[in-house]
C-alpha cells in the first residue's frame, strides 16, 4: 500500500509568491511559492495519485505584513482552501498569546491541529479542550493513518504561550500516544511536528512505532540529486534514521517559506511496516502556474494590507538616525531603537532567579537602510519601517560562547572606516574599541547586562560562559562575514519578522525618543 505525503513547514506568512530568497516578489516571472501556486501542484498530485496527505509542520504564523494585519485568520482561510489534512503547532503559533491562536486559527481551521506534548492546565484547560489534539486518525484510501503532533519544548522561551500550557519533552509525550494507536490497530503512524531536525532524528530513533517523521523549525533542506535552487542540502531526502528497534525511519523537512512542497512516497506492507521511501522537495517555481481562484482570493485579501501600511503606528519626537554615515561608524539611535525593540519582543519572565532569559542584542549597521525624519509630524508607518528594514528578515535567538561574541566584536571593527555593514549596533552591551590597535585586538572593554539578577547591571564578558543573544537571521547565518557566529553557535531559533518587532514596540510605546547613550565607545 502506497502513501504520498505532501508537506510544508515554516511557511511564515508567505501567502503571496516571493523572490528566490523568499523576500517580496519583484520580478513576477522569476517568483516562487505562494498558496496559489502550491494549490496548483497539490491538486495535480491529488488527481494523479490515490492516497495523498497534505501536512504542515508548524510556523505558519509570523513573517510578513499578512500576519501583522490578519493575525492568523489568513492562515486558517487559505489552509482551509488548500484542504490541508493536518497541521502541527509550531512555536510561532503562540506569538500573539494563546488567545491569538484560539480565535483566528484553532476555532476556524477545518483540519485537525496537533500537538501531543502541549498540556493545558488551570482555567485554560476547559477553554482549549478539543481545539487541538495529540493525534488524529485519518482514513486514507482503504487504510487508516495516525498522525501524532509535537511542538518544540523551547516554545516558552521563543514565544508567548503563557503560564497555563506545559511543554513536555517530545519523546516522553509521544510514546504513550503512539502505543495507544498501536493497541487500536493503527499500524501506520506519522510524527508531524516542529522541534527541529535534531529532535526529528531523535524521535525517529527513540519513539517505538513511528514510521515516518515530518518536521520543521530548523528550515532544513534535504535533497537527493542535484538541488534545483540555491539551498544546499543538509542530507538526502528522505533522511533515513535507524531506530533503536532496528527499523529504517524516513525523516523529512521542506526548507521554509513555501518555496518547496515536500513530496514523499512511502510503501507499507500489510502489517504497516515501511518497505520503501523515496521523493524530493518540489521547487514551486514559475513553471507551475498560480491557481486563478486562489490568486483572486489573495488579491481580495491584499487590499487591506495596502491600507494598513500607511497608517500611523506611533510617533517619534527625535530624528531616527538610520543613515549609513552614522550606523556603520558609531552608535546610532536607530540601532538603539531596533535593539531595544528586539529585547522587548523577547521578554519572558523565566523564573525568580532571572529577570529575563536574554538581555543582549547585536545588529549589523549595514542592515539599517534608512533614517526616519521626525519633521513629518513625527508619524511612523509600516511603510517607513519597511524602508529601514527592507529585507524581510527575522530577529532570532541564539546561544553563543563569550569567546564567539568577542570574535564578533573584533570583526565589527576589523576594517573600520570603510563604511562596511559589519559594524555592530547593540543593546544590553557596552563595548569600547581602540582603533589604534591592530585588527583582531581592538576590543578593549566588553561588558554585558546580567540576566540572573534582580537589578540588571553590566559585568565583564566571560569567555567560557554561554550567552543568549538576539540578532538578525542574516548574522546567525554568517552574513557580513560573521562566519564565527554561524560556525560556533550552540543553538539557533528563528524569531519574529524584523519590521513586526519594531512596529509592535513603537505601537506599544506610542511616543519614542531613542538617544545615543554610550553603548559603543572609542578610546
Amino acid at each position: 500500500w502506497e502513501l504520498t505525503i505532501l508537506h510544508t513547514n515554516d511557511v511564515h506568512s508567505r501567502l503571496e509568491q516571493t523572490s528566490e530568497d523568499s523576500s517580496k516578489c519583484v520580478n513576477a516571472s522569476r517568483c516562487m511559492g505562494g498558496v496559489a501556486r502550491l494549490f496548483t501542484k497539490v491538486q495535480q498530485i491529488r488527481r494523479a495519485e490515490p492516497n495523498v496527505l497534505l501536512l504542515d509542520a508548524g510556523d505558519q504564523y509570523q513573517g510578513t505584513i499578512w500576519f501583522t494585519v490578519y493575525k492568523g485568520a489568513e492562515v486558517a482561510h487559505f489552509m482551509n482552501a488548500l484542504r490541508y489534512d493536518a497541521m502541527a503547532l509550531g512555536n510561532h503559533e503562540f506569538d500573539n498569546g494563546v488567545e491569538g491562536l484560539i480565535e483566528p486559527l484553532l476555532k476556524e481551521a477545518k483540519f485537525p491541529i496537533l500537538s501531543a506534548n502541549i498540556k493545558a492546565k488551570g482555567p485554560l484547560a476547559s477553554q482549549i479542550s478539543g481545539l487541538y489534539l495529540p493525534y488524529k486518525v485519518l482514513p486514507v484510501g482503504d487504510e487508516v493513518v495516525g498522525i501524532v503532533g509535537y511542538t518544540s519544548k523551547e516554545t516558552p522561551f521563543l514565544s508567548n504561550p503563557g503560564t497555563n500550557l506545559v511543554f513536555e519533552d517530545e519523546i516522553t509525550a509521544l510514546q504513550p500516544e503512539v502505543d495507544k494507536l498501536k493497541t487500536l490497530n493503527v499500524n501506520k503512524i506519522i510524527a508531524l511536528g516542529h522541534s527541529g531536525f535534531e529532535t526529528d532524528k531523535l524521535i525517529a530513533q527513540k519513539v517505538r512505532g513511528v514510521d515516518v517523521v515530518v518536521g520543521g523549525h530548523s528550515n532544513t533542506f534535504l535533497y537527493t540529486g542535484n538541488p534545483p535552487s540555491k539551498e544546499v542540502p543538509a542530507g538526502k531526502y528522505p533522511f533515513i534514521v535507524t531506530s533503536d528497534d532496528g527499523r529504517k525511519v524516513p525523516v523529512v523537512q521542506a526548507y521554509a517559506f513555501g518555496k518547496y512542497l515536500g513530496y514523499l512516497k512511502i510503501e507499507f506492507d500489510e502489517r504497516g511496516n515501511v518497505i520503501s521511501s523515496h521523493g524530493n522537495p518540489i521547487l514551486l517555481n514559475s513553471s507551475i502556474p498560480e491557481d486563478p481562484s486562489i490568486k483572486a482570493d489573495i488579491n481580495k485579501w491584499r487590499i487591506k494590507l495596502d491600507n494598513y501600511s500607511t497608517q500611523e503606528l506611533g510617533k517619534t519626537i527625535v530624528y531616527l538616525d538610520g543613515s549609513s554615515q552614522s550606523c556603520r561608524f558609531r552608535e546610532c539611535n536607530m540601532g538603539n531603537l531596533i535593539c531595544d525593540a528586539m529585547i522587548n519582543n523577547n521578554l519572558r519572565h523565566a523564573d525568580e532567579m532571572f529577570w529575563n532569559h536574554v538581555s543582549m542584542c547585536i545588529l549589523n549597521g549595514g542592515g539599517i537602510r534608512s533614517p526616519i525624519d521626525e519633521r513629518n509630524n513625527g508619524t511612523i508607518t509600516w511603510e517607513n519601517l519597511a524602508a529601514v528594514l527592507p529585507f524581510g528578515g527575522t530577529f532570532d535567538l541564539v546561544q553563543l560562547k563569550g569567546s564567539t561574541l568577542k570574535k564578533a566584536f573584533e570583526h565589527s571593527v576589523h576594517r573600520y572606516g570603510q563604511s562596511t555593514g559589519e559594524f555592530l549596533q547593540v543593546g544590553g552591551i557596552h563595548v569600547v574599541y581602540d582603533l589604534s590597535r591592530k585588527p583582531g585586538d581592538r576590543v578593549v572593554k566588553l561588558d554585558v547586562l546580567c540576566t540572573k539578577c534582580r537589578v540588571p547591571s553590566y559585568d565583564p564578558l566571560k569567555m567560557d560562559e554561554i550567552y543568549k543573544v538576539i540578532l538578525p537571521n542574516f548574522l546567525a547565518n554568517g552574513g557580513d562575514g560573521f562566519q564565527m557566529i554561524k560556525d560556533e553557535l550552540l543553538r539557533h531559533d528563528s524569531g519574529d519578522q524584523d519590521i513586526n518587532v519594531v512596529s509592535t514596540y513603537i505601537s506599544k510605546m506610542k511616543v519614542i525618543y531613542p538617544a545615543v547613550e554610550g553603548r559603543i565607545k572609542f578610546s
Epitope: 489534539l133 482514513p139 495507544k180
Partner: antibody
Framework: QVQMKQSAAEVRKPGASVKVSCKAS????????MDWVRQAPGQGLEWMGD????????IYNQKFKGRVTMTIDTSRSTAYMELRSLRSDDTAVYYC???????????WGQGTTVTVSS | DIQMTQSPSFLSASVGDRVTITCKAS??????LSWYQQKPGKAPKTLIY???RLIDGVPSRFSGSGSGTDFTLTISSLQYEDMATYYC?????????FGGGTKLEIK
C-alpha cells in the same frame, strides 16, 4: 442546502443482496467522506463503514467485512451501499451520512428501510 | 473496539429543566465525540461534534463538554421539541461506536 436523498424501501429474501443509494446535493460531493449507519427496529445505531468519494477508498466495520461493498458514482454525486447474504437480523433502516472536515457525521439521509423476510 | 456507555438510558424531565446526559468511553477518545438527536420515525440529527462544537443551526440551549473518557450533553432549558432519543458516538478510531442511547421524555 446540504441534502442526502436515499432510495426507496426494499424487501429481500434471506441470502439475497440489496443495494441502497444516496444522492447528495448542496455541496461539492468529493470534498466529504460518506458514512453508512444502520438501525434495527427498536435498537440503537450501528456504524457500518466509510467511503472517500475522491478515490473510492473504504474503511469497513469488521462485523460487515466480506458482506458489504460501498461504492460511489461521482458523476451522479451518489454513494451506494450493497449488503450481501442477507439475514433476518439485517432488517433495519440504513442511513447515509456525510462527514465533515473532522470526520464527524453532520448531515444524514432520510433512511432506507430494508426488510429481510422469507 | 471502544465501548461507549451512555447514561441514563431513560430520562423524564419537565419543560424548562436543565438536563444532562453522560457518555463514558472505555478509553481516552481525544475529544472525538459527537451527539445526535433522533425523533421517532426520523433520521438522526447532528447536534455537536469534537465534544463541544455546535453544528450550525442547532439551538444554543444544547452544549457539550468533557474530555478524555467522560462527556456530557446539556440542555440548559428543556423544550417540548427536545423529546427524542440522544446518542453519542466516538469517532477517534475505527470502527466508530455509538452509545446505547438515552430516551428523553417530557413529564
Amino acid at each position: 442546502q446540504v441534502q442526502m436523498k436515499q432510495s426507496a424501501a426494499e424487501v429481500r429474501k434471506p441470502g439475497a443482496s440489496v443495494k441502497v443509494s444516496c444522492k447528495a446535493s448542496g455541496y461539492t460531493f468529493t470534498d466529504s467522506n460518506m458514512d453508512w449507519v444502520r438501525q434495527a427496529p427498536g435498537q440503537g445505531l450501528e456504524w457500518m463503514g466509510d467511503i472517500n468519494p475522491n478515490n473510492g477508498g473504504t474503511i469497513y466495520n469488521q462485523k460487515f467485512k466480506g458482506r458489504v461493498t460501498m461504492t460511489i458514482d461521482t458523476s451522479r454525486s451518489t454513494a451506494y451501499m450493497e449488503l450481501r447474504s442477507l439475514r433476518s437480523d439485517d432488517t433495519a433502516v440504513y442511513y447515509c451520512a456525510r462527514t465533515n472536515w473532522d470526520y464527524a457525521m453532520d448531515y444524514w439521509g432520510q433512511g432506507t428501510t430494508v426488510t429481510v423476510s422469507s | 473496539d471502544i465501548q461507549m456507555t451512555q447514561s441514563p438510558s431513560f430520562l423524564s424531565a419537565s419543560v424548562g429543566d436543565r438536563v444532562t446526559i453522560t457518555c463514558k468511553a472505555s478509553q481516552d477518545i481525544n475529544s472525538q465525540l459527537s451527539w445526535y438527536q433522533q425523533k421517532p420515525g426520523k433520521a438522526p440529527k447532528t447536534l455537536i461534534y469534537r465534544a463541544n462544537r455546535l453544528i450550525d443551526g442547532v439551538p444554543s440551549r444544547f452544549s457539550g463538554s468533557g474530555s478524555g473518557t467522560d462527556f456530557t450533553l446539556t440542555i440548559s432549558s428543556l423544550q417540548y421539541e427536545d423529546m427524542a432519543t440522544y446518542y453519542c458516538l466516538q469517532y477517534d478510531v475505527f470502527p466508530r461506536t455509538f452509545g446505547g442511547g438515552t430516551k428523553l421524555e417530557i413529564k
